[in-house]
């Protein structure tokens, strides 16, 4: 294995649970979010694969509210406003990290959790399976 | 005031940095992610607003690799394969939480950080500004 020198000034980690348990500063730093990410929020209506946003709420999780995209149609919206069922609206999914109290009700002990969320929808050409 | 008993079994918090600095278990629990989010990865090619995935790597961050979507075209791809510039390919962005090592290179000390990532692209009708 690679020997990593212990940096002086690093918190001590002589903990039987290390490296599974680490110290995390909860003072969130904002990186590259000077532009409002919500700027893209009207895309859900203007997209050829429009979507609705549904509120997923869990007070024991941080963030407590996550907005989930659900595609409005199976097909995609054409210029005339009709739905083209030869194309498919599909959700674009992403895994995100959330925090959960663990053990529950402990004020300063948390566990990272990965959840899969639908962020929006895109219009794709369907995969056509030809039967021999 | 209300006396709240300290839960037995909770980690000790007699740390000079507490309560901004807390213990987080990195043994990540996967919730609703039995399906591989990469399953949707072929959408980047099949979409009418196709995108390329760029690897954003930072060993001081967790997750260290984040895939960033960059729309391939300003317009959207028509059925015949040509680009329709009367429509726009736009990135769907989301703010996500990541962990960043702080101080740098310390193996078990992190800070929460919010970053804005482009997850994929969608095809939208442009906003036309009419000049009087």
């Amino acid at each position: 294995g690679i020997a990593i020198p212990r940096n002086s000034g690093c918190p001590n980690s002589e903990d039987k649970n290390f490296p599974r348990t680490v110290m995390v500063n909860l003072n969130i730093h904002n990186r590259n979010t000077s532009t409002n990410p919500k700027r893209s929020s009207d895309y859900y209506n203007r997209s050829t694969s429009p979507w609705n946003l549904h509120r997923n709420e869990d007070p024991e999780r941080y963030p407590s509210v996550i907005w989930e995209a659900k595609c409005r149609h199976l097909g995609c919206v054409k210029a005339d406003g009709n739905v083209d069922y030869h194309m498919n609206s599909v959700p674009i999914q992403q895994e995100i990290l959330v925090l959960r109290r663990e053990p529950r009700h402990c004020p300063n002990s948390f566990r990272l959790e990965k959840i899969l969320v639908s962020v929006g929808c895109t219009c794709v050409t369907p995969i056509v399976h030809h039967v021999a | 005031g209300i006396a709240i008993p300290r839960n037995s079994g909770c980690p000790n918090s007699e740390d000079k940095n507490f309560p901004r600095t807390v213990m987080v278990n990195l043994n990540i629990h996967n919730r609703n992610t039995s399906t591989n989010p990469k399953r949707s990865s072929d959408y980047y090619n099949r979409s009418t607003s196709p995108w390329n995935l760029h690897r954003n790597e930072d060993p001081e961050r967790y997750p260290s690799v984040i895939w960033e979507a960059k729309c391939r075209h300003l317009g959207c791809v028509k059925a015949d394969g040509n680009v329709d510039y009367h429509m726009n390919s736009v990135p769907i962005q989301q703010e996500i939480l990541v962990l960043r090592r702080e101080p740098r290179h310390c193996p078990n000390s992190f800070r929460l950080e919010k970053i804005l990532v482009s997850v994929g692209c969608t095809c939208v009708t442009p906003i036309v500004h009419h000049v009087a």
Epitope: I28, N45, I66 | R20
Partner: antibody
Framework: QVQLQQSGPGLVKPSQTLSLTCAIS??????????WGWIRQSPSRGLEWLGR?????????DYAVSVKSRITINPDTSKNQFSLQLNSVTPEDTAVYYC??????????????WGQGTLVTVSS | EIVLTQSPATLSLSPGERATLSCRAS???????LAWYQQKPGQAPRLLIY???NRATGIPARFSGSGSGTDFTLTISSLEPEDFAVYYC??????????FGQGTKVEIK
């Protein structure tokens, strides 16, 4: 610069409906990074959150349990404002009513912009 | 409903002194959803701190916040004459659970 301007009567009779309006300048009632709420303050109850509206592809209304059966908050996108209606008022509803913008980024939640407040007295 | 209990009810101090205000929740709340406000007579509350420890735009560095779980603190390192007011903490637990503390009045001794 975001500003909230409240308007509405300062005196309401018991059993009637309290109606207040909050006009928004510098932001949009349909903004997807904010919610728009009403809070009241009285000596007996202190600061009490009443409810909010927010727009995320559709309108969401959230009301405090204490007033849920009597309250309605409505947006008016054409005038960029929102209103509060509280039905069947009693003298206990006498308070200073504030409208406020709630920053709603999912990562944080707080009221950063407040209206000037309207003292509403419920009395016959 | 989460109850926020602020203490002391009144704090009598002189300009230049340090003020420490406490806010205790009846159950755990996420520090990210804890805010502090200042209110002067005849005025609307003004946001000071959000996310338990982040100063709002234009708030002087003498105001600081800390805390986690159920115990939160607002500290004014050196009181200025304009700091004498009532201070409120506020939590958001869910879309239907948003409460304020009863307030701490900081008055001139």
């Amino acid at each position: 610069q975001v500003q909230l301007q409240q308007s509405g009567p300062g005196l309401v009779k018991p059993s009637q409906t309290l109606s207040l309006t909050c006009a928004i300048s510098g932001d949009s009632v349909s903004s997807s990074s904010a919610a728009w709420g009403w809070i009241r303050q009285s000596p007996s109850r202190g600061l009490e959150w009443l409810g909010r509206i927010s727009y995320r592809s559709k309108w969401y209304n959230d009301y405090a349990v204490s007033v849920k059966s009597r309250i309605t908050i409505n947006p008016d996108t054409s005038k960029n404002q929102f209103s509060l209606q509280l039905n069947s008022v009693t003298p206990e509803d006498t308070a200073v009513y504030y409208c406020a913008r709630e920053v709603d980024s999912i990562y944080y939640s707080y009221f950063d912009i407040w209206g000037q407040g309207t003292l509403v007295t419920v009395s016959s | 409903e989460i109850v926020l209990t602020q203490s002391p009810a009144t704090l009598s101090l002189s300009p230049g002194e340090r003020a420490t205000l406490s806010c205790r929740a009846s159950q755990n709340v996420w520090a990210f959803y804890l805010a502090w406000y200042q209110q002067k007579p005849g005025q609307a509350p003004r946001l000071l701190i959000y996310g338990a420890s982040n100063r709002a735009t234009g708030i002087p560095a003498r105001f600081s916040g800390s805390g986690s779980g159920t115990d939160f603190t607002l500290t004014i390192s050196s009181l200025e004459p304009e700091d004498f007011a009532v201070y409120y903490c506020q939590q958001y637990r869910s879309t239907l659970s948003l409460t304020f503390g009863q307030g701490t009045k900081v008055e001139i001794k």
